[in-house]
């Protein structure tokens, strides 16, 4: 960067090279050029010459003052106008940064995705700091009192093999940068309570052209967890509001869920699961799109037609289908 240049003098920043965004700062440039009493000293920010708020301090030094500096990063350098020199002479350069001290990390969450072999811990870091901010994740066994620390820039994956201190732990996060340090509240976890089942995936959909057309959604998970609760949400792609259906599921076979939907409409489906009675859900699965066919059966009652198509009731019976979808994208 700019800091690697050969200097004929030096440049420094007050209060510091890394400072709080919005502060007033002063950048000083002091020339030490052989056979040159500088006529003028010039400052450049990101290659653009600065025009205002430059004050000469003495024969060799000038100050550039910025009010309410808001740029996260800038490369500064200064030059001298030497008598009998046609071009400006480079004095020195420095990279400067502005940002914020970290907020207190909150919403610390640790989960074990089934089969991953890792405990994944995440948190809400708060407002953007703009400067290099490091996080230390502390994991302390409540059984052995042993504490381990993990350094990261965002989230952390901790191998479950390294968690040798039993099942119960305290987890907390420390955030630190050049402008400050903060620590989260402690989260108490039990390894058995934080497992998230293997991802549930919608594999296909089919609409059966019966008296009342019905759509069957096929979905599955590779989980070995016995008691799993799932939710499937669906809506017409033109709608804002989701319909949600709940299931107690046994994944020893592919799940089939039946819906009565409006004809000739594109729907989107998503599913998620959790170990029954536990805290953490899977994220919603990728959107699965299915368009119902145009054919509208003859129905005597408009009210009945309307109610049935909008009910979205799940039916226990299983049927073989005619119109099939297998499109994960749009």
């Amino acid at each position: 960067g700019i800091t690697n240049i050969n200097c004929s003098g030096h440049i420094w920043v007050e209060p510091a090279t890394i400072f709080k965004m919005g502060m007033n700062i002063s950048i000083y440039c002091q020339a030490a050029i052989k056979n040159c009493q500088p006529r003028k000293l010039h400052f450049y920010k990101n290659g653009i010459k600065e025009r205002f708020q430059i004050t000469r301090i003495n024969k060799t030094t000038a100050r550039l003052w910025y009010k309410n500096f808001l740029e996260p990063h800038a490369s500064m350098y200064c030059t001298a106008e030497c008598p009998k020199h046609f071009q400006e002479t480079l004095i020195c350069g420095k990279d400067i940064s502005s940002g914020y001290p970290p907020d207190i990390p909150d919403e610390v969450t640790c989960v074990i995705y089934e089969y991953s072999g890792n405990m994944t811990c995440t948190w809400n870091a708060g407002k953007l700091t703009y400067i290099d901010t490091k996080y230390v994740v502390h994991v302390k066994s409540l059984e052995t009192e042993e504490e381990q620390q993990y350094l990261t820039s965002s989230y952390i994956n901790i191998s479950t093999d390294s968690l040798q201190g039993g099942k119960k732990y305290l987890v907390w996060v420390q955030a630190a940068n050049a402008l400050g340090m903060e620590e989260s509240k402690q989260l108490q976890i039990h390894l058995d309570d934080i497992v998230i089942p293997s991802a549930a995936v919608i594999s296909r959909a089919e609409t059966i052209n019966a008296t009342v057309p019905k759509t069957i959604i096929y979905w599955d998970s590779q989980t070995t967890i016995e008691k799993v609760s799932c939710e499937m949400r669906y809506k017409a792609t033109t709608n804002q509001t989701w319909n949600v259906k709940e299931f107690d599921t046994n994944f020893t076979y592919v799940q089939q869920s039946e819906f009565y939907l409006e004809p000739n409409i594109k729907y989107v489906f998503q599913v998620r699961c959790q170990e029954t009675g536990k805290r953490y859900w899977q994220p919603w699965s990728s959107p699965f799109f299915h368009k119902t066919p145009e054919t509208v059966p003859q129905v005597t009652s408009k009210a009945f037609q309307h109610d049935t198509w909008n009910s979205g009731l799940t039916v226990a019976s299983i049927s073989t289908g005619h119109l099939t979808s297998d499109n994960r994208g749009d």
Epitope: R39, K40, I48, K49, R51, I54, R56, P83
Partner: antibody, heavy 119, light 107 residues
Framework: QVQLVESGGGVVQPGRSLRLSCAAS????????MSWVRQAPGKGLDLVAD??????????YYADSVKDRFTISRDNSKNTLYLQMNSLRAEDTAVYYC??????????WGQGTLVTVSS | DIQMTQSPSSLSASVGDRVTITCRAS??????LAWYQQKPGKAPKLLIY???SLQDGVPSRFSGSGSGTDYTLTISSLQPEDFATYYC?????????FGQGTKVEIK
């Protein structure tokens, strides 16, 4: 050689607007700072507005007396400097000179254009 | 802004006289000073820049000197065409500022 020709001066009523132009030739226009310097009758020279060169990202400066009323601009493709003068006052009456600066002193000047603000 | 004070505000002199005009800055301007000559109805003309450098085409009877806050324009032998008003300009700190002018009149 360097030539600067101002135009657009004249008699105008207080509160009205006027736009001055300065056509430049004989130098690399975008590499030079351009200024408007005025001289009230029988008085000294005053920098009114300045628009700097490309290396300064064309930063502008205005004297306190004209801030929020005057706007300096340049069209590098036409080698022309402008001064848009709004809400003119009697005290804006002066000869307005267009001037060139490479360093910060004014190297070349136009012949000037007279602006008279009178009711 | 840096204030520039010129003295005298006017002077009377004869052809052949040595004339000295001074300019004082409110702070050190590190030889960033220019001198201009202005004749009635005409634009100012640059005579000297960087306190002592003569602009191309300017007669050698004009010279400039000084450092720190005090600067001088000297006309070694006044000529008829030199009767005019002279201005100093500091360009050490932005914005550049002019002195109030010195009028050189025929005695």
């Amino acid at each position: 050689q360097v030539q600067l020709v101002e135009s657009g001066g004249g008699v105008v009523q207080p509160g009205r607007s006027l736009r001055l132009s300065c056509a430049a030739s004989g130098f690399d226009f975008s590499s030079y700072g351009m200024s408007w310097v005025r001289q009230a009758p029988g008085k000294g020279l005053d920098l009114v507005a300045d628009i700097n060169s490309k290396s300064y990202n064309y930063a502008t400066y205005y004297a306190d007396s004209v801030k929020d009323r005057f706007t300096i601009s340049r069209d590098n493709s036409k080698n022309t400097l402008y001064l848009q003068m709004n809400s003119l006052r009697a005290e804006d009456t002066a000869v307005y000179y267009c001037a060139v600066h490479h360093s910060d002193y004014f190297e070349y000047w136009g012949q000037g254009t007279l602006v008279t603000v009178s009711s | 802004d840096i204030q520039m004070t010129q003295s005298p505000s006017s002077l009377s002199a004869s052809v052949g006289d040595r004339v000295t005009i001074t300019c004082r800055a409110s702070q050190d301007i590190y030889t960033n000073l220019a001198w201009y000559q202005q004749k009635p109805g005409k634009a100012p003309k640059l005579l000297i820049y960087h306190a002592s450098s003569l602009q191309d085409g300017v007669p050698s009877r004009f010279s400039g000197s000084g450092s720190g806050t005090d600067y001088t324009l000297t006309i070694s032998s006044l000529q008829p065409e030199d009767f005019a008003t002279y201005y100093c300009l500091q360009d050490s700190e932005y914005p550049p500022t002019f002195g109030q002018g010195t009028k050189v009149e025929i005695k």
